[in-house]
Amino acid sequence: AWELTILHTNDVHSRLEQTSEDSSKCVNASRCMGGVARLFTKVQQIRRAEPNVLLLDAGDQYQGTIWFTVYKGAEVAHFMNALRYDAMALGNHEFDNGVEGLIEPLLKEAKFPILSANIKAKGPLASQISGLYLPYKVLPVGDEVVGIVGYTSKETPFLSNPGTNLVFEDEITALQPEVDKLKTLNVNKIIALGHSGFEMDKLIAQKVRGVDVVVGGHSNTFLYTGNPPSKEVPAGKYPFIVTSDDGRKVPVVQAYAFGKYLGYLKIEFDERGNVISSHGNPILLNSSIPEDPSIKADINKWRIKLDNYSTQELGKTIVYLDGSSQSCRFRECNMGNLICDAMINNNLRHTDEMFWNHVSMCILNGGGIRSPIDERNNGTITWENLAAVLPFGGTFDLVQLKGSTLKKAFEHSVHRYGQSTGEFLQVGGIHVVYDLSRKPGDRVVKLDVLCTKCRVPSYDPLKMDEVYKVILPNFLANGGDGFQMIKDELLRHDSGDQDINVVSTYISKMKVIYPAVEGRIKFSTGSH
């Protein structure tokens, strides 16, 4: 028997420095977790102790903090090189700055293979990108070889900016011939490494003949066997075992997100490359693991140029940006309108001639808007200003919901109106009218939504049975502020871009902003 140790990360999202327990900015260092310096310490410990170790990443290193805003992926290549990753799969966020923003900083600079079997380049891009990412890679590990085959969410064109010269094929259809090719090369130990979410990971384990292990990402899935060490609730045991269509037991793993855990899976293979046993658990990277001093010093020197960024002007406002709780928790506020407009603008994807855009709606809990911005400071808006408005380090995500779920969400928005509670929704691409004289649960008297399958966008009444795409904070997607119905009833959830980054990019693009209160949220006569 031959034993392999798979160390894995996914959805690190620019958390190069250690973070607090909830993966936001580290405040009390003695309680902080993750970060590449701490990750390196643990990886090195394991490399020294065990003979056959692979360090893999399942995508979405890009996007999430000011590190990515400034360094645009060069930081990913540099620190992944320093940690000596063995392979990485492309995630959807790796395309956030277009194909060029992937090629230059990462693909050309990475000293490890970057993989995806279901992304095919065409046109002029085909020769430009040739060899910079691969469908699979055969890695020597000790005296053996291991095949790693990559995959990426086929929804990427709706979630990021891959352009028109990359085709995202069905994962299973694309993976099978590559695995077959590995078999003909006498590679009998094959890991599928990719970024399509836990449901697809399980399908790959079930359907793709010859895949021995699946290491996934995208859905931020936390798996654990035994008592979990932090706040994350396991979605199943680690590894999650799938019985394949040809009767094999295939371990599937994922390691939550944000570099908080290091996935640790030990696989035993027989001489024919069959998995005999698999066991392990994610390792919580808490402060009991010291940060490696040389990587930490490297992080500190990269930081020198970051500190100045937050005080630089992104653009100007010529109006007061009312982000006060007195406004945003009671009525339409122009800060809410600005943020929602930025959220929609960040998700413009012209992928189908029938649709002007794939999504037109935004909802945003008023309690998530934490500060106004005064225009009397020469109109200047800085990252620092936006960090006061959106201090929680969240993301603006894409969900699919039925109309009936949206209706429940808007009822929840005003179910205890008047108490300055955070669930009051700010909106974009939605016109809502409330009648507060009616009883809670029956206060939404009009709910019109902006069409997407139209050449001239207009507002139509919400249909209860129709499925709608909505952009919203991850906080709401996870049921925050009592929006349990969103968490329970959502049909799809894809994590998006860092909240501040979305708004700062929009302001930089617009240069001068003047958001108004324009009647998106109304109260019927006599009730307000």
Partner: antibody
Framework: QVQLVQSGAEVEKPGASVKVSCKAS????????ITWVRQAPGQGLEWMGD????????NYNEKFKTRVTITADKSTSTAYMELSSLRSEDTAVYYC???????????????WGQGTLVTV | AIQLTQSPSSLSASVGDRVTITCRAS??????????MHWYQQKPGQAPRLLIY???NLESGVPSRFSGSGSGTDFTFTISSLEAEDAATYYC?????????FGQGTKVEIK
């Protein structure tokens, strides 16, 4: 090999603007900061500011902040420094330099352009 | 901004002499095991050339007679055995925080 090639000498009138270019080759332009440094005749070196071409992020010396604009064109691997409201004391050689700071040199200026003399 | 003061402002020495230049920073420029001080040589009519980075690291292709030392606020640049081609002005520069600044320079002449 790494090269930074700057535009030629300029003569400008007081109150005018000047834009100096710096074409980079031999390395990944988007992954390293480009700095602008000036040197008045017989004087020392003065750090004006820098740009990270990958993101367009800039830092400026307060002394020049209202008058200098540093930009970069990724498509041509060229950085630019524009100085406005020129006065006679802006007569100097203007240098662009590549910072090595993302690996070992830590923002030390490891490659320099040949310099551009601006006479006001 | 951090001020850098070089001394002497000029010196004259013979070929083969040991030459030492100091650079004092108005604030600590060392952190996390790194000292963010660099040294450059500039000859008349030429662009500056990086000699030493991070206080003591010799840039590739630079002769070993050049060296640097120091940490915190006090740094030293040394030419162990002066050669005729070393006649130039030498500058220190810090990169600890923005704005990065240079010392005023030390002119080295050959007697």
């Amino acid at each position: 090999q790494v090269q930074l090639v700057q535009s030629g000498a300029e003569v400008e009138k007081p109150g005018a603007s000047v834009k100096v270019s710096c074409k980079a080759s031999g390395y990944t332009f988007t992954s390293y900061w480009i700095t602008w440094v000036r040197q008045a005749p017989g004087q020392g070196l003065e750090w004006m500011g820098d740009i990270y071409p990958g993101s367009g992020n800039t830092n400026y010396n307060e002394k020049f902040k209202t008058r200098v604009t540093i930009t970069a064109d990724k498509s041509t691997s060229t950085a630019y420094m524009e100085l406005s409201s020129l006065r006679s004391e802006d007569t100097a050689v203007y240098y662009c330099a590549k910072e090595g700071g993302l690996t070992t040199e830590d923002y030390a200026l490891d490659y320099w352009g040949q310099g551009t003399l601006v006479t006001v | 901004a951090i001020q850098l003061t070089q001394s002497p402002s000029s010196l004259s020495a013979s070929v083969g002499d040991r030459v030492t230049i100091t650079c004092r920073a108005s604030k600590n420029v060392s952190t996390s095991g790194y000292s963010y001080m660099h040294w450059y040589q500039q000859k008349p009519g030429q662009a500056p050339r990086l000699l030493i980075y991070l206080a003591s690291n010799l840039e590739s292709g630079v002769p070993s007679r050049f060296s640097g030392s120091g940490s915190g606020t006090d740094f030293t640049f040394t030419i162990s055995s002066l050669e005729a081609e070393d006649a130039a002005t030498y500058y220190c520069q810090h990169s600890r925080e923005l704005p990065f600044t240079f010392g005023q320079g030390t002119k080295v002449e050959i007697k």
